[in-house]
Interface confidence: medium
């Protein structure tokens, strides 16, 4: 058995349902998406050995499903998946990877073929610990690369300052696949939000630890950089579920500390 969870039940139905639902969110000129063709292009990876799937195996899938990302609406993240999805609000506020069509159809899903058979493996799928070229990691690598290339204007990044290993994972999708593919000529500045869990530890904040590494890397690449601790609109959303916690006592907006380059 592999270390990861098996293929999600009803994978095709979920995929096609999400695709059809998402088409309604696209502008009329971008709405002509063939969900079955997109599924078939995605399914190319399901015909391959589960440790032999490359990011490029998803090229056609990306080419059929990609669409423009509104300027200033990109939201990158690490270790804050659920919070990002909630805050983005189905593209209303922002459009993270999970809110573009090619990310939406696969969000929180798992998939792989059986090792020596053509059927799907519903028991387990490989993770990066099992093999690098597994279907799910290769998918998100390819999707992350495309998302970065298509992002423009102000780039927003939500990081988790309560993460024990630090807010900015030196080895992660943001570091390895997204930052290198940002198109400098299309980007005005990068704004980082370091969020801390309500009642959780404050492991890192702007300008500390791994955040200094990130700041240096982005500045060295020539990006204008700013960092905000506990960006208030996101903090208010976190507080919906913790309304009586002291961290959620209403204070002036000035309480959110800010460091600008």
């Amino acid at each position: 058995r592999w270390r990861g969870e098996g293929t999600s039940a009803h994978l095709r139905d979920i995929f096609l349902g999400r695709c059809a639902e998402y088409r309604a969110l696209l502008s009329p000129e971008q709405r002509n998406k063939n969900c079955t063709a997109i599924w078939e292009a995605f399914k190319v990876a399901l015909d391959k050995d589960p440790c032999s799937v490359l990011p490029s195996d998803y090229d056609l899938f990306i080419n059929l499903s990609r669409h423009s990302i509104p300027r200033d609406k990109s939201l990158f993240w690490e270790n804050s998946h659920l919070l990002v999805n909630s805050f983005a609000d189905n593209t209303r506020r922002f459009m993270p990877l999970s809110d573009v069509l090619y990310g939406r159809v696969a969000d929180f899903l798992s998939w792989c073929r059986q090792k020596n058979d053509s059927g799907l493996d519903y028991q387990s799928c490989p993770t990066s610990e099992d093999c690098e070229n597994n279907p799910v990691d290769s998918f998100w690598k390819r999707a992350s690369i495309q998302y970065s290339k298509d992002s423009s204007g102000v780039i927003h990044v939500m990081l988790n300052g309560s993460e024990p290993t630090g807010a900015y994972p030196i080895k992660g999708f943001f570091a390895d696949y997204e930052i290198p593919n940002l198109q400098k000529e299309k980007i005005t500045r990068i704004e980082i939000w370091v969020m801390h869990e309500i009642g959780g530890p404050n492991v890192e904040s702007c300008g500390e630890g791994s955040m200094k590494v990130l700041e240096k890397r982005l500045k060295d690449m020539g990006f204008q950089y700013s960092c905000i601790n506990d960006y208030r609109p996101v903090k208010l959303l976190q507080c919906v579920d913790h309304s009586t916690h002291p961290d959620c006592a209403l204070k002036s907006a000035a309480a959110a500390t800010q460091r600008k380059a």
Epitope: N32, N34, T36, A37, I38, N63
Partner: antibody
Framework: QAYLQQSGPELVKAGASVKMSCKAS????????INWVKQSHGKSLEWIGN????????YYNQMFTGKATLTVDQSSNTAYMQLKSLTSEDSAVYFC?????????WGQGTLVTVSA | DIQMTQSPSSLSASVGDRVTITCSAS?????MYWYQQKPGKAPKLLIY???NLASGVPSRFSGSGSGTDYTLTISSLQPEDFATYYC?????????FGQGTKVEIK
């Protein structure tokens, strides 16, 4: 085994329209894209476009936009292609084929001859 | 659109010969597909994902390549292999085919 059965040859007058069919059997019709490919006499293959039988959405090669119209009838597992304003340039064999990007299954082809 | 250029456009060969057909794409593509077509028939898939043999295709057929340059090889030409061969790119719509290579009996 998947099988695509196309309608018979058509002899049509210039300026008229023609509608040909492609009946699928041996697999779940709604699960696979149906493509249409043109082959003029002695020439190569040209991809016209495809249709998603599940939702009915279409994707056309720009060269054929306005010339071809793709439809499906789920109840009869049949895909259709209508060609309008026919000219001698439209005289060709038209194939239907299954797949989103490459085609392991093809119909036998429908010959369309446009006469003056 | 990605343009596909096959060479040669035709060739004459004898039974038992090794035959190589090349296909060049105008920009990089992920995979190449190869079809065989005989007169009056629909094309038949030979090779998918650049190098994999389609079901029922003899092992004398093989495919290779990457980026913009791809090759179909028939290791030992048989009488039933005299036909026209087409390459097709996978990477983006519109899907495009090469102009074909006709393999004739010498």
């Amino acid at each position: 085994q998947a099988y695509l059965q196309q309608s018979g040859p058509e002899l049509v007058k210039a300026g008229a329209s023609v509608k040909m069919s492609c009946k699928a059997s041996g697999y779940s019709f709604i699960e696979y894209t149906i493509n249409w490919v043109k082959q003029s006499h002695g020439k190569s293959l040209e991809w016209i476009g495809n249709i998603d039988p599940y939702y009915g959405t279409t994707y056309y090669n720009q060269m054929f936009t306005g010339k071809a119209t793709l439809t499906v009838d789920q109840s009869s597992n049949t895909a259709y292609m209508q060609l309008k304003s026919l000219t001698s340039e439209d005289s060709a064999v038209y194939f239907c084929a299954r797949g989103s990007a490459w085609f392991p299954y093809w119909g036998q082809g429908t010959l369309v001859t446009v006469s003056a | 659109d990605i343009q596909m250029t096959q060479s040669p456009s035709s060739l004459s060969a004898s039974v038992g010969d090794r035959v190589t057909i090349t296909c060049s794409a105008s920009s990089s593509v992920t995979y190449m597909y190869w079809y065989q077509q005989k007169p009056g028939k629909a094309p038949k898939l030979l090779i998918y994902d650049t190098s994999n043999l389609a079901s029922g295709v003899p092992s004398r057929f093989s495919g290779s390549g990457s980026g913009t340059d791809y090759t179909l090889t028939i290791s030992s030409l048989q009488p039933e292999d005299f036909a026209t061969y087409y390459c097709q790119q996978w990477s983006n719509y519109p899907l495009t085919f090469g102009q074909g290579t006709k393999v004739e009996i010498k």
